[in-house]
């Protein structure tokens, strides 16, 4: 079952005063140990730690003359990063991506820009989500899943790619954003934080949560990921924070129960199908929408990302599975793999709920800073 | 039910060489980090050596590198540890161990290496 | 390496009394910290893992806390069967280290 925490009236992390400055989003300071691309997160002496290996997505798709038309994914190339303190007696540590792919990881070098110069980019993922100053836009309709209920048979394969835990969608799983904002899923994964350290990827008022999951979809309107990329509204991202609750989370238990089978990085094993819509919060209606980038190289603009208002719950014992039990490069632990929230550059976030709502009963009039953008232009 | 079974042990002169075997079952050990870990008698317990689910990364303690090599088997469900140059010093139980996010989870019930003229 | 330092050695209380160990790491290891405890003449049972939590089937009067150097391992309410060597380990990176070991007995 799923034990989303229900949010009716107040948005995700609370209200806020809010000035009347979009630009004073860039870069609300959050967690102290948030690691950027050129500042590793470091803290105490954890040996490794501070080359913690990353991340997500990168849907990178096969030349059609190997696959026609295939919506194949393949996993974004490994990241470096030294061993542990104690150099391992031998490294027969496979790269299964070849020495000719680009190298990247959270903290240190190389910096991101010179792995993919779009992650300099303006507009880029993911950042801090300030509610009050969002702008309400009731054209956002609620989002609609289409066949993600998946059976037992076919199983899907759960990968440590090295940067997070990836799990390849079947084709069928239809989305959509509004009328015409058709897409489809490819995969999901998930971004965590560390030893009772929150590692979501977005944050609330500079609240960061313990972890988030990303299901990384396909616009209808391309055949192929790398058609896509950089493309506005070519790639969509479902978003929602993880939160602690009291229950396990059987939905998730599916998923973390494996985790053991693929501690290693490169390893993978194949998992029953499952209902993917019920990794997510059940409110499809309340969440916010703007327009920014991969969070990892190749960093590609362009991506519509959706965050949930509501949370999905997990229990203690199922989030210290996800961040303790996964290896990556160099035998580092894979842990804290999220990038530091980016500027707005003048980006607004729409809502779809009139989430600058200050909930208080001496609220007579709602304070809305930003002006909705039509949905879907 | 988790099973961890050593083997191998036994009376063995200063410079010479011994081989443990540690057999696993109830859990699929072609996933799971495997230890060795030792205890002298009366004394308390120390790390000796770590090897990847893969055998991708392996690690020793001080005391023993360059003297001991640990290895698995994952068709056969076995961890190895070669044992060369014994000492005195190395007369402990052994211990097979496995690794997961809740450290040292299962221990086998040990085996005892005595090195000794 | 990272060091453990457990301390004390040994220590000798009453059944009911609430007993403290504890364990220092000589550099920060988040909350890598396992607790176990020994029994004479048998194999290591782990008690905690993660500084806190407990493994299923322990008794509720062994709790553990701390994390970054200091760590505790707290038994509530000392009972005879509670009598063994107790380790820390720490378990972040190679090579794991255990600490030199607690010796409870009953008074």
């Known amino acids: 079952q799923r034990l989303p925490r229900m949010q009716e009236d107040s948005p995700l992390g609370g209200g806020s005063s809010g000035e009347d400055d979009p630009l004073g989003e860039e870069d609300l300071p959050s967690e102290e140990d948030s690691p950027r691309e050129e500042d590793p997160p470091g803290e105490e002496d954890l040996p490794g730690e501070e080359d913690l290996p990353g991340e997500e997505d990168l849907p990178e798709v096969k030349p059609k003359s190997e696959e026609e038309g295939s919506l194949k994914l393949e996993d974004l190339p490994t990241v470096e990063a030294p061993g542990d303190p104690q150099e391992p007696q031998n490294n027969a540590h496979r790269d299964k991506e070849g020495d000719d792919q680009s190298h990247w990881r959270y903290g240190g070098d190389p910096p991101w820009p010179r792995v993919s110069p779009a992650c300099a980019g303006r507009f880029q993922s993911p950042v801090d989500i300030r509610p009050q100053l969002a702008a309400f836009c009731p054209a956002l309709r609620p989002l609609e899943l289409l066949g993600f209920q998946l059976p037992p048979l076919p199983e899907l394969r759960l990968r440590n790619n090295g940067h997070s835990v990836q799990l390849t969608l079947p084709p069928g799983l239809e989305m959509a954003l509004g009328p015409g904002r058709e897409y489809r899923a490819l995969q999901l994964h998930l971004h965590w934080g560390a030893a009772g350290r929150p590692g979501s990827e977005h944050t609330v008022e500079g609240h960061r949560f313990p972890a988030e999951i990303h299901v990384v979809h396909l616009s209808t309107a391309f055949a192929r990921v790398d058609e896509a990329l950089g493309r506005p509204g070519g790639l969509a991202v479902l978003a929602a924070f993880l939160e602690e609750g009291p229950e396990e989370n059987s939905a998730y238990e599916q998923l973390l129960s494996r985790l053991e089978e693929i501690a290693e990085e490169g390893s993978e094993t194949q998992v029953p199908g499952l209902d993917i819509s019920a990794l997510l919060p059940s409110d499809f209606s309340r969440y916010f929408q703007y327009e920014g980038s991969l969070t990892t190289p190749p960093c590609a603009q362009g991506v519509i990302w959706t965050v949930f208002n509501q949370t999905v719950m997990l229990s203690a014992k199922q989030l210290h599975t996800l961040s303790d039990t996964l290896w990556g490069p160099g035998d580092s632990r894979l842990q804290l793999n999220f990038r530091a929230t980016q500027p707005l550059n003048g980006r607004v976030i729409e809502a779809s709920f009139p989430a600058g709502v200050d909930s208080s009963p001496r609220a007579a009039e709602p304070v809305q800073l930003n002006s909705c953008l039509a949905a879907g232009d | 039910e988790v099973q961890l079974v050593e083997f191998g042990g036994g009376l063995v002169k200063p410079g010479g060489s011994l081989r443990l075997s540690c057999a696993a079952s109830?859990?699929?050990?072609?996933?799971?980090?495997m230890n060795w870990v030792r205890q002298a008698p009366g004394e308390g317990l120390e790390w000796v050596s770590s090897?990847?689910?893969?055998?991708?990364?392996?690690y020793y303690a001080d005391s023993v590198k360059g003297r001991f090599t640990i290895s698995r088997d994952n068709a056969k469900n076995s961890l190895y540890l070669q044992m060369n140059s014994l000492r005195a010093e190395d007369t402990a139980v052994y211990y097979c161990?496995?690794?997961?996010?809740?450290?040292?989870?299962?221990w086998g019930q040990g085996t005892l290496v005595t090195v000794s003229s | 390496d990272i060091q453990m330092t457990q301390s004390p050695s040994s220590l000798s209380a009453s059944v009911g009394d609430r007993v403290t160990i504890t364990c220092r790491a000589s550099q920060g290891i988040f909350n890598y910290l396992a607790w176990y405890q020994q029994k004479p003449g048998k194999v290591p049972k782990l008690l905690i893992y993660a500084a806190s939590t407990l493994q299923s089937g322990v008794p509720s009067r062994f709790s553990g806390s701390g994390s970054g150097t200091d760590f505790t391992l707290t038994i509530s309410s000392l009972q005879p069967e509670d009598v063994a060597v107790y380790y820390c380990?720490?378990?972040?990176?190679?090579?794991?280290?255990f600490g030199q070991g607690t010796k409870v007995e009953i008074k």
């Open positions: 109830g859990f699929t050990f072609s996933s799971f980090r």
């Open positions: 161990a496995r690794f997961t996010a809740m450290a040292l989870d299962y």
């Open positions: 380990l720490k378990y972040n990176s190679a090579p794991w280290t």
């Open positions: 090897i990847t689910s893969s055998s991708s990364y392996i």
